[in-house]
């Protein structure tokens, strides 16, 4: 019964953690730069994303502009994409395959192999996690570098958006739901029987104990 | 006092090479990038690039990329620019210059080293 | 590349003149704008940067204003060290670049 709520736990988590990756990867909160203008008066606040970029004026308007050229855009870019995308599928392959061999399901009967699916599931989880994590802690590593290098013009310098706060959360509830997922099986299933399991009970030999000794060997 | 002691003039030959330097004096020189502007006789400014002395990152302008290379020797808190493959386009006063702590501007500049470059 | 564009390549002026300098972006630089003053022989002198900040040194007859695209750099009854080419430049994005330099000469 504590499996079955775990796996649930697990779940439910990576679900949670699948359309927090959902939303931080299409949102084009990754990079945010508030451009000054006079004194402190904020002339526009610049949006960038893996897919779009936005400008909100300071009149409220907001235009936004859909990446044309996938050749023309930036390797890192381009890897940030494609392991979003990647997460996502193998996120979701997992809820899939958790799905299959969850406790409370009759996919599969045997509950050795039950085991394995929800182990599978839960290590297909903890990778799609670290693959959002990633693209979310490379994005951030470039963003501080490129604050505090002084090299680097204004116009350059960027600032951590949402997305990023919320691909780390998402990566988190990934990873977690997928050890959860991972922690649900217990090891006596991919343990093979050493002898052949009898079917009687073997007596005991101290009376006192009152114990039957089950699938002695 | 800041200082920017630039080297002497240099005359060249086409195609060839020439390292100018920079000897910098009177703050802590790992502080503050170091930039290196070109001023052909009565024309505007153009700015090449610059060096981050703490750990030798540079950026350039597209226009001199492969043709100068900045570097630094803290050491002698000196920084350097080479320019290679040299034409007559490249005959100009080079100035060194300190950028501004909080803004991309220049406070200082050196004197500023004559190139030309002749047969 | 930010083009900086200084209308007036020449102004002939005359001591205790107010001149106005103008310089035009090509696009927004959000007041990232310096302003120096170059003499004959001598290397540039920052005057003025963030558009409205002056450095210290800089004699207070000297002001800058602007916004967006447009600065200008005002100088109030002018006198004889005041004859020098004055250069604007730009420090929002890199390359940095520079306006095409105001001479001011005395009449």
């Known amino acids: 019964m504590a499996s079955t709520g775990l796996e649930l736990l697990g779940m439910t988590l990576a679900v949670l953690g699948w359309l927090g990756t959902l939303v931080s990867c299409a949102l084009p909160l990754w990079k945010v730069t508030a451009f000054i203008g006079n004194s402190i008066v904020v002339a526009q606040v610049v949006w960038e994303g893996l897919w779009m970029s936005c400008v909100v004026q300071s009149t409220g308007q907001m235009q936004c502009k859909v990446y044309d050229s996938l050749l023309a855009l930036p390797q890192d870019l381009q890897a940030a994409r494609a392991l979003c995308v990647v997460a996502l599928l193998l996120a979701l392959l997992g809820l899939l395959v958790a799905i299959t061999g969850a406790q409370c399901t009759t996919c599969v009967e045997d509950e050795g192999a039950k085991a394995r699916i929800v182990l599978t599931a839960g290590v297909l989880l903890l990778l799609s996690g670290i693959l959002v994590l990633i693209p979310v802690c490379w994005t951030a590593h470039a963003i501080i570098q490129d604050f505090y290098n002084p090299l680097v013009a204004e116009a350059l310098k960027r600032e951590l958006g949402a997305s990023l706060y919320l691909g780390w959360a998402a990566a988190a509830l990934l990873m977690l739901g997928g050890g959860l997922l991972c922690c649900t099986c217990p090891p006596s299933h991919f343990e093979r029987p050493r002898g052949p399991r009898l079917g009687y009970s073997i007596p005991s030999r101290s009376g006192a104990s009152g114990l039957d000794k089950r699938d002695y060997v | 006092e800041v200082q920017l002691q630039e080297s002497r003039p240099e005359l060249v030959k086409p195609g060839a090479s020439v390292k100018i330097s920079c000897k910098t004096s009177g703050y802590t020189f790992t502080e503050y990038t170091l930039h290196w502007v070109k001023q052909s006789h009565g024309k505007s400014l153009e700015w090449i690039g610059g060096?981050?002395?703490?750990?030798?990152?540079?950026i350039y302008n597209q226009k001199f990329k492969g043709k100068a290379t900045l570097t630094v020797d803290k050491s002698s808190s000196t920084a350097y620019m080479e320019l290679r493959s040299l034409t007559s386009e490249y005959s100009a006063v080079y100035y060194c210059?300190?950028?501004?702590?909080?803004?991309?501007?220049?406070?200082?500049w050196g004197q500023g080293t004559s190139v030309t470059v002749s047969s | 590349d930010i083009q900086m564009t200084q209308s007036s390549s020449s102004f002939s002026v005359s001591l205790g003149d107010r001149v106005t300098i103008t310089c035009k972006a090509s696009?927004?630089?959000?007041?990232?704008l310096a302003w120096y003053q170059q003499k004959p022989g001598n290397a540039p002198r920052l005057l003025i940067s963030g558009a409205t900040s002056l450095e210290t040194g800089t004699p207070s007859r000297f002001s800058g204003s602007g916004s967006g695209k447009d600065y200008t750099l005002s100088i109030t009854s002018l006198r004889t060290e005041d004859a020098a080419t004055y250069y604007c430049q730009q420090y929002w994005s890199t390359p940095l670049t520079f306006g095409t330099g105001t001479k001011l000469e005395l009449k």
């Open positions: 210059a300190r950028r501004a702590i909080t803004v991309y501007a220049m406070d200082y």
């Open positions: 060096i981050n002395p703490n750990n030798g990152d540079t």
């Open positions: 696009e927004d630089i959000y007041n990232r």
